[in-house]
């Protein structure tokens, strides 16, 4: 067929997207590259429903998403508009905190232990979630 009808092995299908949940940690840029090599991107949260789905799978663990402001304004990695889109920041976040002593501020967004978002130092080795739209996934049958 011209489109894939199910997700690759070890990926979870939800609302026409496939999700992969890491069980180890990487810096944000390395997590971003991981998803890209898998023909995916770091998860882009576009609704409260998607937020709850991801939150259910990651549990109370700091986890990178595909949102950053390393070049100035906040941007989603797939081009989804940040200003008009879904947001779920913790109170008083993002704050670009410089007090961590690691140099610079905080340019990468992650899910916190309660699922709400925080900005943090991009080098921290957090878990991550990859996402790919089902009709953009590889055009082959699922791996056996």
């Amino acid at each position: 067929g011209s489109e894939r009808t199910c997700c690759p092995v070890n990926w979870v299908e939800h609302e026409r997207s496939c999700y992969w949940f890491s069980r180890s940690g990487k810096a944000w840029a390395d997590a971003d590259n991981y998803c890209r090599l898998e023909d995916a991107h770091l998860v882009v949260v576009t609704s409260w429903e998607e937020q709850k789905f991801v939150q259910h799978h990651i549990g109370p663990v700091n986890t990178w998403m595909g949102l950053h402001d390393q070049n100035g304004p906040w941007k989603w990695v797939d081009g989804t508009d940040y200003e008009t889109g879904f947001k779920n920041w913790r109170p008083e976040q993002p704050d670009d905190w410089y007090g961590h002593g690691l140099g610079g501020g905080e340019d990468c967004a992650h899910f916190t232990d309660d699922g709400r978002w925080n900005d943090d130092v991009c080098q921290r080795p957090y878990r991550w979630v990859c996402e790919t739209e089902l009709d953009k996934a590889s055009q082959e049958p699922p791996l056996l």
Epitope: P8, N10, W20, S24, G25, K26, A27, A29, D30, N33, Y34, R36, L37, E38, D39, P125, S138, Q139, E140, P141, L143
Partner: antibody, heavy 119, light 107 residues
């Protein structure tokens, strides 16, 4: 049985170009990221480039960025490495390799093809 | 770039010996490490992935351990087919980098 067959190597002058090919069989080619690795004579292994299964994302070592281009034709089950502006230090055996999903190790390798850059 | 340093650079051993090769990363790579065996004129062969997972078809005398920055490849009882060069590779961050190799020679 998974097989990778490297070809396209040869003798080329500095500044010249060459295109390497890697013909794959025995697995669903488009489902796997692929990579090129090289080994200069008597030296260790050096990662050169990688490409995602659908070909939309590519990655390069700094030593080849802007000169080499990795690509793939999934309809032909073939991986390519276009090498331009070749230098003497690019002389090496070039191997293509299949990448294990999720783990990112190279589980199958081609037999290698020798590229010699010399005047 | 992450530097991978192997030690020793070569080791002389006899059949039946236990051989240990170490690999150190210049920064933490969790368990994103692979080990390969290479014989002269041949392509490398994957032995271990994810630091400790034995690749299918590889004899159980090979094992890997470690996490973070320090890793070990152990051959529990060296066999004639094991005389070769072994190298580690980190796949945590691009550019992926290899160790310089450890040559296991016959004593």
């Amino acid at each position: 049985e998974v097989q990778l067959l490297d070809s396209g190597g040869g003798l080329v002058q500095p500044g010249g170009s060459l295109r390497l090919s890697c013909a794959a069989s025995g697995f669903t080619f488009s489902s796997y990221a692929m990579s090129w690795v090289r080994q200069a004579p008597g030296k260790g292994l050096e990662w050169v480039s990688a490409i995602s299964g659908r070909g939309g994302n590519t990655f390069y070592a700094e030593s080849v960025r802007g000169r080499f281009t990795i690509s793939r034709d999934n309809s032909k089950n073939t991986l390519y490495l276009q090498m331009n502006s070749l230098r003497a230090e690019d002389t090496a055996v070039y191997y293509c390799a299949k990448i294990i999903r999720e783990q990112w190790a190279f589980d199958y390798w081609g037999q290698g093809t020798l590229v010699t850059v010399s005047s | 770039d992450i530097q991978m340093t192997q030690s020793p650079s070569s080791v002389s051993a006899s059949v039946g010996d236990r051989v240990t090769i170490t690999c150190r990363a210049s920064q933490g790579i969790s368990n994103w490490l692979a080990w390969y065996q290479q014989k002269p004129g041949k392509a490398p062969k994957l032995l271990i992935f994810a630091a400790s997972n034995l690749q299918s078809g590889v004899p159980s005398r090979f094992s890997g351990s470690g996490s973070g920055t320090d890793f070990t490849l152990t051959i529990s009882s060296l066999q004639p087919a094991d005389f070769a060069t072994y190298c580690c590779q980190q796949v945590n961050s691009f550019p992926w980098t290899f160790g310089q190799g450890t040559k296991v020679e016959i004593k």
